[in-house]
Structures are given as structure tokens and as C-alpha cells.
């Protein structure tokens, strides 16, 4: 008879920690309970963005970020002239470090970088850099967008006014104005060597709470070549507490990044909490859904000649955009449960982001190993509503791996879901 089952998500090899090595060489961490602490939040699930307001009331405010910027409705603001950057051309010192916070990868800046102009009320000092990205293949990962077009990565640089506050954290805790720059990364065929120190750093912070010192880099080289075309609006932090204190500068032109370099972002892990248990998962799609503009106006810079080149050079290039790659983010919330001694039920939830709706059906693939033989089957679930499938004739002494993929209208596919392993152990009673 079926005595007990073990069911857990499969991770990639080489995770350091409390791992069980399965026979396919995948490393798996058994889920652990969350320790109590600060209000927990996540980018999906029970602690996802729609629930942030329960612990951070500002997240329900009317001046939230990020937003979609519609260029034709942005009005030129004569006060938004050239940015003055100071220290951005210097190489960073060896004290600059990177940390995997579990929600993003942050660069903690230890040198003096100052920005003024662009309507900022004073001379602001750069404190940190954070990144937001998608799930794979250059899929949409930016928080802001222009005319509905999102980018694979958004880099955000946060600033505070050192004349008013002794630290960035003080400015936030006192709900005072901070500045933020948003820089889009767009896929290009070649590596961007300016990003090499960042990409190298990412490989040192693959796991949650890891930290590493960064090789020297030039912050100016991480910004667009032309800084003259930017948008300005007043918004919020894009993570709890969502304080509405941010003067946003969103650069229209992107910075190039290769697919190869993007992979470093997609290889980052986090620790997620769902149903009172923790699991190690990839940190992907770490962006907040876009917020309503309400009564705000988006302005655009008045820098002479900066808007002359049309956006078509990057906005209409399908290379690397989600449109050319995958139809949705992966199906989520994979579960495998025994129905009886010879049948299993696989269930999942629809992808969180669908780039090319609608999803027409789902492909369920499962493989198993018995007597050193590996077999695989795939079948289609013709539904966008009933997201479960029954697997019959399950062998009780085999290890099963399940994964699900969405199929969209244009026959494009999503990425595969997290792979679930299922082991049914048999014991004579």
C-alpha cells in the first residue's frame, strides 16, 4: 500500500545548504518554516503585491510606482534640463559591494556620486543600485514601461539629500523626498563590457543573503549613452513600505545587455514563503505590477535635440523582447498529490504574466525512472480553467518528475514550470 510520499520542487545542482541529492543530480531543499520577524512580502502568492497594503498602508496610495509612461501624453517641462552628474566617471572603490536581498540584487555604493538638475530639489547623493528582471530569454522584467513596452531589466539608482539627512534610511523613515533613476536594459547581440563587474558580482551572490565585493566599475557606463531624454514624475518606492516620496527620473534610452549576461540575473535564487513554509526558488519576475497614474502628470525633459532620434531604434526592435520569445511566464503553484495507490493529480496555477493572451491549453510532461530506464510522456490539457490533470498507472517504486508549460494562441509556449519531484514509497503493513 501507499505509505507515504515525498513531494518537493527540483532545483539546480550545487545549492549549498540542507539538501537532498536525488538520483537525477538535482539538488532539493526540504521546505522549512519561516522564522518570525519583519512583515513578510513577496512578488507573488499570499504575500504578493495585492496584499502589501495590509502591512504597508501606503501601498494603496494614489501616487504609486511603477507606471506605464505614454509618451504622447507626457508634456515637456522647461525646468527639466540637463542632469549634472558628479563622480559618475570615477572607478568604484573596492569597498563597493553587492548583496542578494532575496527580493533584488543590490549594489551598495561606497563612493561619492552626486546628481543635480532635472528638477531635483538640491544635490542628491547615490546610495544604492537595485535591479528588477523577468524570468528568461529577455522576457519583460522592467517595472516601468514606455508606451506599454517593457524591457528585460530595469536598474534603479536611489539618491538622498545629504544636506538634509545623515543617511538614506533616515530620509525614508522620515518620509522625505528621495530621488530615483530608472534605466532600462535591452537585449543586444554582444556582451556589454561595462556590465562585466556587475555580471561577475551576480555569480557571487547566487543565494539569498550572499554578499560580495565588486570589481571596479564606472557608474556612468551603466547609464544610457545619451542622458538628455528622460521622463519625470512623482511616485513611490516600488516595494513596501511604498512611501510616496520618490522623484523619478526614467531614461528613455536603454543600455545594451546580451542574452549571455542576462542569464546571470536568471540564475539568482531567493527564499520564498508559501503556506507557512520556506522554499528555495529562482528569483525571477521581481517587479511590482504597474500602478494607476490618477491625477499625476508625467513630464519629459526639455534638453535641446535630445528627443530627435525616434524610439524606433530600440522600441520597435523585437530582438530580445518578450514578444519574440515566450508567450507567458511559467505556470506556478505546482502541486502533486496522490489520488489513490496508482494515480496522482498534478495541479498548477496560471502564469502571472501573459504576454500573448490567451492561453489555449497546457502541456504536462512527466518522466520517471524505473530499473535505470528513463521514460517520458507528454499530453495536452485543453483548458484554461480546470488546471489539474490525473496521471494513472503510477508505479509505486518510481521517482516521477512533473512540469507544465502553457501554450498560447500563436502556438508560442511559456517557460516550463518549476519541476516537481514525486516519490511514492511502499511499505508492507
Amino acid at each position: 500500500v501507499l505509505h507515504y510520499v515525498v513531494c518537493f520542487p527540483a532545483l539546480t545542482e550545487g545549492y549549498v545548504g540542507a539538501l537532498h541529492e536525488n538520483r537525477h543530480g538535482s539538488a532539493v531543499q526540504i521546505r522549512r518554516r519561516k522564522a518570525s520577524g519583519d512583515p513578510y512580502w513577496a512578488y507573488s502568492g499570499a504575500y504578493g503585491p495585492e496584499h502589501w497594503v495590509t502591512s504597508s498602508v501606503s501601498c494603496g496610495g494614489r501616487h504609486q510606482s511603477p507606471i506605464d509612461i505614454l509618451d504622447q501624453y507626457a508634456r515637456v517641462g522647461e525646468e527639466y534640463q540637463e542632469l549634472q552628474l558628479d563622480g559618475f566617471d570615477n572607478e568604484s572603490s573596492n569597498k563597493t559591494w553587492m548583496k542578494n536581498t532575496g527580493k533584488t540584487v543590490a549594489i551598495l555604493l561606497k563612493d561619492d556620486y552626486f546628481v543635480s538638475g532635472a528638477g531635483l530639489p538640491g544635490r542628491f547623493k547615490a546610495e544604492k543600485v537595485e535591479f528588477h528582471w523577468g524570468h528568461s530569454n529577455g522576457s519583460a522584467g522592467s517595472e516601468h514601461s514606455i508606451n506599454g513596452r517593457r524591457f528585460p531589466v530595469e536598474m534603479q539608482i536611489f539618491f538622498y539629500n545629504p544636506d538634509d539627512f545623515d543617511s538614506f534610511q533616515t530620509a525614508i523613515s522620515e518620509n522625505r523626498i528621495i530621488g530615483a533613476m530608472a534605466i532600462f536594459f535591452q537585449v543586444s547581440p554582444r556582451d556589454n563590457s561595462a556590465l562585466d563587474p556587475i555580471i561577475h558580482g551576480l555569480k557571487g551572490v547566487v543565494h539569498h543573503e550572499k554578499e560580495t565585493f565588486l570589481d571596479p566599475f564606472v557608474l556612468r557606463d551603466l547609464l544610457p549613452a545619451s542622458l538628455g531624454s528622460y521622463y519625470r514624475y512623482t511616485g513611490s518606492l516600488t516595494t513596501p513600505p511604498c512611501s510616496e516620496i520618490v522623484e523619478w527620473i526614467v531614461f528613455r534610452r536603454p543600455v545594451p545587455i546580451s542574452y549571455h549576461q542576462l542569464e546571470a540575473f536568471y540564475s539568482i535564487f531567493t527564499t520564498e514563503q508559501q503556506d507557512h513554509v520556506k522554499s528555495v526558488e529562482y528569483l525571477r519576475n521581481n517587479f511590482r505590477p504597474q500602478q494607476r497614474l490618477h491625477d499625476r502628470v508625467v513630464s519629459k525633459s526639455a534638453v535641446r535635440d535630445s528627443w530627435n532620434h525616434d524610439m524606433t531604434d530600440f522600441l520597435e526592435n523585437p530582438l530580445g523582447t518578450e514578444a519574440s520569445k515566450v508567450c507567458s511566464s511559467p505556470p506556478i503553484h505546482m502541486k502533486v498529490q496522490p489520488l489513490n495507490q496508482t494515480a496522482l493529480q498534478v495541479s498548477w496555477s496560471q502564469p502571472e504574466t501573459i504576454y500573448h493572451p490567451p492561453i489555449m491549453n497546457y502541456m504536462i510532461s512527466y518522466s520517471w525512472t524505473k530499473n535505470e530506464d528513463e521514460k517520458e510522456k507528454t499530453f495536452t490539457k485543453d483548458s484554461d480553467k480546470d488546471l489539474k490533470a490525473t496521471i494513472s498507472h503510477v508505479s509505486p517504486d518510481s521517482l516521477y518528475l512533473f512540469r507544465v508549460q502553457a501554450v498560447c494562441r500563436n502556438d508560442m509556449r511559456s517557460d516550463f514550470s518549476q519541476t516537481m519531484l514525486f516519490q511514492a514509497n511502499t511499505t508492507r503493513i
Partner: antibody
Framework: AQSVEESGGRLVTPGTPLTLTCTVS????????MSWVRQAPGKGLEWIGV????GSTWYANWVKGRFTISKTTTVDLKITSPTTEDTATYFC??????????????WGPGTLVTVSS | SFVLTQPASVQVNLGQTVSLTCTAD??????ASWYQQKPGQAPVLLIY???RRPSGVPDRFSGSSSGNTATLTISGAQAGDEADYYC?????????????FGGGTQLTVTG
């Protein structure tokens, strides 16, 4: 605000090709799919077809080559050889982007095509 | 191809609750949407994904689904609710695709 408007509807004789145009405002046609829907006088809504952001098209089973959807900066519906049964108000509608199902949340006011000899 | 079946007409007294149905085998596995169309106007999306209401749609309108039937319920019917109501859904595979409207229900509010 985002909006769509149809034009090109008029009285035509059977067999005379006619192209209707859907002009959009504030909508990025490389991101959104646009459908054409028609409604004969006193009858219900009838989906004709859709063109998505990448330019792929799908048509209702009954269309069978009678209509062609294309786009540039506008979305066009060509009625290749109109018959009297094609007399209807033709609507252009924007699909809701990013939803798990397809819904039309922005519609134009419609343009009337009358096919008569 | 499949057909969504709706009653041709339904009457409701002012202030009462009325339910409009839409039936098709495909609705057991596909989500339904509901549109309202008043004479001489374009349709307006009322309900999507069986139960969800777009912003701006009064909460008197609600959707539900069970088995192969989707239902639009209007509670506290008002004179302004007099209109044609269409259910709709999509179906197909990755390479084929259809969007289908029901025949529509003409709602008359009396009293």
C-alpha cells in the same frame, strides 16, 4: 486615453472590394491585438478575426477567405467580395492585454457597411 | 465550431434580481465574458473570466459559472439596465483560435 475609431463604411454594390480602417489613439499596435466584430441590423455580435502584436491573424471558421485583416499604423479589414449578407455595423475592438482570457475592453463606435445592388 | 446558447429575451421588474444564462459544453473548460450593448452603441465589457468585474462596472452585476453554464446576475435591476447582453468565450488550440459570441439576450425592465 486610449481609443479606437472605425472608418470606411459606405454603400457598395455586391462584389466590390471594400477596406475598413481602424485608427487607434494611445494604443501600441505592436503590443496589443485588435479584433473586428460585426453586427447585422437587428442581429447579434459576430467575431470576424484578430491580428496580434506580431501581425499574426486568426479568423472565424465561417470567414473562409471573405475577409483579410492587416495593419500598418492602422488596422484594416478588407471585405474581398461583399454580398448582401455582409451588410452590418463593423466594430474594431482592442483586446485586453496581459489577461489570461481574451476580452474586448475598448471598442470603436462602429462603421456601417451597406451592400446593395 | 461551438455555439453559446442564450435565451432570446428576459423580463425583470424594476428593483428585482435577474439571472441571464449562457450554455455550452466548452464553458466547463473555458472562461466566459459578458458584454452589455444598448441600442445604437458599442458593446461594453461587464464581466470577464467568469466572475471578474472591470473597474467602473457597478457591483450590481456579477458573474458565476458552474459546469457548462455561465450566469450573469443583475441585482436591483434599473431602467438603465435595459439592453442586449452577450456572453462570449474563446476556444481552440495553440495554432487555431476562435472567439464566439452567444446570440444575445434582450433584457426588458418593467414597472
Amino acid at each position: 486615453a486610449q481609443s479606437v475609431e472605425e472608418s470606411g463604411g459606405r454603400l457598395v454594390t455586391p462584389g466590390t472590394p471594400l477596406t475598413l480602417t481602424c485608427t487607434v489613439s494611445g494604443i501600441d499596435l505592436s503590443s496589443y491585438a485588435m479584433s473586428w466584430v460585426r453586427q447585422a441590423p437587428g442581429k447579434g455580435l459576430e467575431w470576424i478575426g484578430v491580428i496580434d502584436g506580431s501581425g499574426s491573424t486568426w479568423y472565424a471558421n465561417w470567414v473562409k477567405g471573405r475577409f483579410t485583416i492587416s495593419k500598418t499604423t492602422t488596422v484594416d479589414l478588407k471585405i474581398t467580395s461583399p454580398t448582401t449578407e455582409d451588410t452590418a455595423t463593423y466594430f474594431c475592438a482592442r483586446e485586453d492585454y496581459g489577461s489570461e482570457t481574451i476580452d474586448f475592453n475598448i471598442w470603436g463606435p462602429g462603421t456601417l457597411v451597406t451592400v446593395s445592388s | 465550431s461551438f455555439v453559446l446558447t442564450q435565451p432570446a429575451s428576459v423580463q425583470v421588474n424594476l428593483g428585482q434580481t435577474v439571472s441571464l444564462t449562457c450554455t455550452a459544453d466548452t464553458l466547463s473548460r473555458r472562461y466566459a465574458s459578458w458584454y452589455q450593448q444598448k441600442p445604437g452603441q458599442a458593446p461594453v465589457l461587464l464581466i470577464y473570466r467568469d466572475t471578474r468585474r472591470p473597474s467602473g462596472v457597478p457591483d450590481r452585476f456579477s458573474g458565476s459559472s458552474s459546469g457548462n453554464t455561465a450566469t450573469l446576475t443583475i441585482s436591483g435591476a434599473q431602467a438603465g439596465d435595459e439592453a442586449d447582453y452577450y456572453c462570449a468565450t474563446s476556444d481552440g488550440s495553440g495554432s487555431s483560435y476562435q472567439y464566439v459570441f452567444g446570440g444575445g439576450t434582450q433584457l426588458t425592465v418593467t414597472g
